[in-house]
Interface confidence: low
């Protein structure tokens, strides 16, 4: 009778993570008598996957009934495959021996390759806000995919970005891989509603890429522009001065009125109006009693936006020596000075 051969017909098997791998193995003879064992890898460091004779292997099931006397099919199924299961699996026939069974013949091996999906990309931006015209960096990370080949693209509002660097780790062969990419984005005043998108395409995703997003509203700070104007007089010897605070983001803003350098009133932006681009406008007014002042009055609107150094705009009210004679025509002029 011809000597027993162990046949593993599949040189390689490709399985998606989470699925079941079937590793086929048949023997050409019932002789010699002895169990079959499955190993991952060869040599002294090989890992036992299944032992027909003894042991508990919860993830492994046999394809046929190994208890039947004439069974020569030793194929197994391994459930819930992960990238860590990748490797070459050997079906090994042992000959009954005393005290221990003796390895008799091994199959040629079946290489199990695992396809694993990348995790959802996570996009993170800078820790501190930045103002328009500045360049900020965003990072995108995705993990756990296999095989290694992957495509990553960056977009800002649907427009593809080109200034980025990507690394896939590890460089060598591994059971699974991670991708890390850093993109540089130049901020504009219109970016409050903008989004940065990291898109990852992989063979396991079947043409439906994964996307991670970051809102630039969490990154951008648009400093306000200030305009101080004098409104028509409401009553004799009273002047209404308004401070228009325009196009700022985020909303956190505190305004202080100063009369000749002395604090007159401080308030926090509350009832703001929102512009189409996502920035805010706000207006504060100050009623000045001109008759209470002997000399010219320097009114300053000072704004502290989002914890940044204050910016200010001043307005000079010219107070006449004889205000009553001048009545409502009290001279006032806007110096247009913009102080930081």
């Amino acid at each position: 009778e011809e000597e027993l051969q162990v046949i593993q017909p599949d040189k390689s098997v490709l399985v998606a993570a989470g699925e079941t791998a079937t590793l086929r193995c048949t023997a050409t003879s019932l002789i010699p008598v002895g169990p079959i064992q499955w190993f991952r890898g060869a040599g002294p460091g090989r890992e036992l996957i299944y032992n027909q004779k003894e042991g508990h292997f919860p993830r492994v099931t046999t394809v046929s009934d190994l208890t039947k006397r004439n069974n020569m099919d030793f194929s197994i199924r391994i459930g819930n495959i992960t990238p860590a299961d990748a490797g070459t699996y050997y079906c090994v026939k042992f000959r009954k021996g005393s005290p221990d069974d003796v390895e008799f013949k091994s199959g040629a091996g079946t290489e199990l390759s695992v396809r694993a999906k990348p995790s959802a990309p996570v996009v993170s931006g800078p820790a501190a806000r930045a103002t328009p015209q500045h360049t900020v960096s965003f990072t995108c990370e995705s993990h756990g995919f296999s095989p290694r080949d992957i495509t990553l693209k960056w977009f800002k509002n649907g427009n593809e970005l080109s200034d980025f660097q990507t690394n896939v780790d590890p460089v060598g062969e591994s059971v699974s891989y991670s991708i890390h990419s850093t993109a540089k984005v130049v901020l504009t005043r219109e970016d409050v509603h903008s989004q940065v998108i990291c898109e990852v395409a992989h063979v396991t995703l079947q043409g439906d890429p994964l996307r991670g997003t970051a809102n630039l509203s969490e990154t951008i700070r648009v400093p306000p522009t200030l305009e101080v104007t004098q409104q028509p007089v409401r009553a004799e010897n009273q002047v209404n001065v308004t401070c228009q605070v325009r196009k700022f983001y985020p909303q956190r803003l505190q305004l202080t009125w100063l009369e000749n350098g002395n604090v007159s009133r401080t308030e926090t932006a509350s009832t703001v109006t929102e512009n189409k681009d996502g920035t805010y406008n706000w207006m504060s007014w100050l009623l000045v009693n001109v008759s209470a002042h002997r000399d010219d009055v320097k009114l300053t609107c000072q704004v502290e936006h989002d914890g940044q150094p204050a910016v200010s705009k001043s307005h000079d009210l010219k107070v006449s020596a004889h205000p009553k004679e001048q009545g409502s025509n009290t001279a006032a002029e806007n110096t247009g000075s913009n102080e930081r």
Partner: antibody
Framework: QVQLVQSGAEVKKPGASVKVSCKAS????????MHWVRQVPGQGLEWMGW????????KYSQKFQGRVTITRDTSATTAYMELSSLRSEDTAVYYC????????????WGKGTTVTVSS | DIQVTQSPSSLSASVGDRVTITCRAS??????LNWYQQKPGKAPKLLIH???SLQAGVPSRFSGSGSGTDFSLTINSLQPEDFATYYC?????????FGGGTKVEIK
């Protein structure tokens, strides 16, 4: 149709550098890798490296590491291969080839650029 | 690095013959193997990718098989335009590598 148009033949002196361009058209440039392969006269094909046009990830053959630089310009849909410190044995035809992102086969090839290194 | 050994390095055949070229990888490469045809003075042309997938536009007389370490390219009923050099290429790991080539000549 999909095509790769390479720059013209070059004659260089030993120690010099050469930069070969490969203009892609007829497909989405950023959806593929671009490989560079060379063939010394009368010999076989030798892979030099690739650039993934989408994310600019680059991989060089260890044999050419430090001498070869592969870049790409997405706006011009063009890939470039620069080889420095040229020696006579670098005399070869240099091909660019579009690469698939999974199996890394090269399905579209440029016509090749002949680089002659001679003193 | 993975070495790819192609055999034979050359062969002579007649029109209508069935020709088989083999390629062996130094380690298992699953089905990450591709076949190319190159004619003198021309760029290589992809025939088969992923061991057995025929590239669009390539005649069906070309076929590929194999997995792991051993692969073959078969040309059924050789045609006059098939006389060329054929290369296999592994794309399992970098550096990507080509076989030494098989020159198919007219007998």
């Amino acid at each position: 149709q999909v095509q790769l148009v390479q720059s013209g033949a070059e004659v260089k002196k030993p120690g010099a550098s050469v930069k070969v361009s490969c203009k892609a058209s007829g497909y989405t440039f950023t959806s593929n890798a671009m490989h560079w392969v060379r063939q010394v006269p009368g010999q076989g094909l030798e892979w030099m490296g690739w650039i993934k046009a989408g994310n600019a990830e680059i991989k060089y053959s260890q044999k050419f590491q430090g001498r070869v630089t592969i870049t790409r310009d997405t706006s011009a849909t063009t890939a470039y291969m620069e080889l420095s410190s040229l020696r006579s044995e670098d005399t070869a035809v240099y091909y660019c080839a579009r690469g698939d992102y999974y199996y890394y086969y090269m399905d579209v090839w440029g016509k090749g650029t002949t680089v002659t290194v001679s003193s | 690095d993975i070495q790819v050994t192609q055999s034979p390095s050359s062969l002579s055949a007649s029109v209508g013959d069935r020709v088989t070229i083999t390629c062996r990888a130094s380690q298992s490469i699953s089905d990450f193997l591709n076949w190319y045809q190159q004619k003198p003075g021309k760029a290589p042309k992809l025939l088969i990718h992923a061991a057995s997938s025929l590239q669009a536009g390539v005649p069906s007389r070309f076929s590929g098989s194999g997995s792991g370490t051993d692969f073959s390219l078969t040309i059924n009923s050789l045609q006059p335009e098939d006389f060329a050099t054929y290369y296999c290429q592994q794309s399992y790991s970098t550096p990507l590598s080509f076989g030494g080539g098989t020159k198919v000549e007219i007998k």
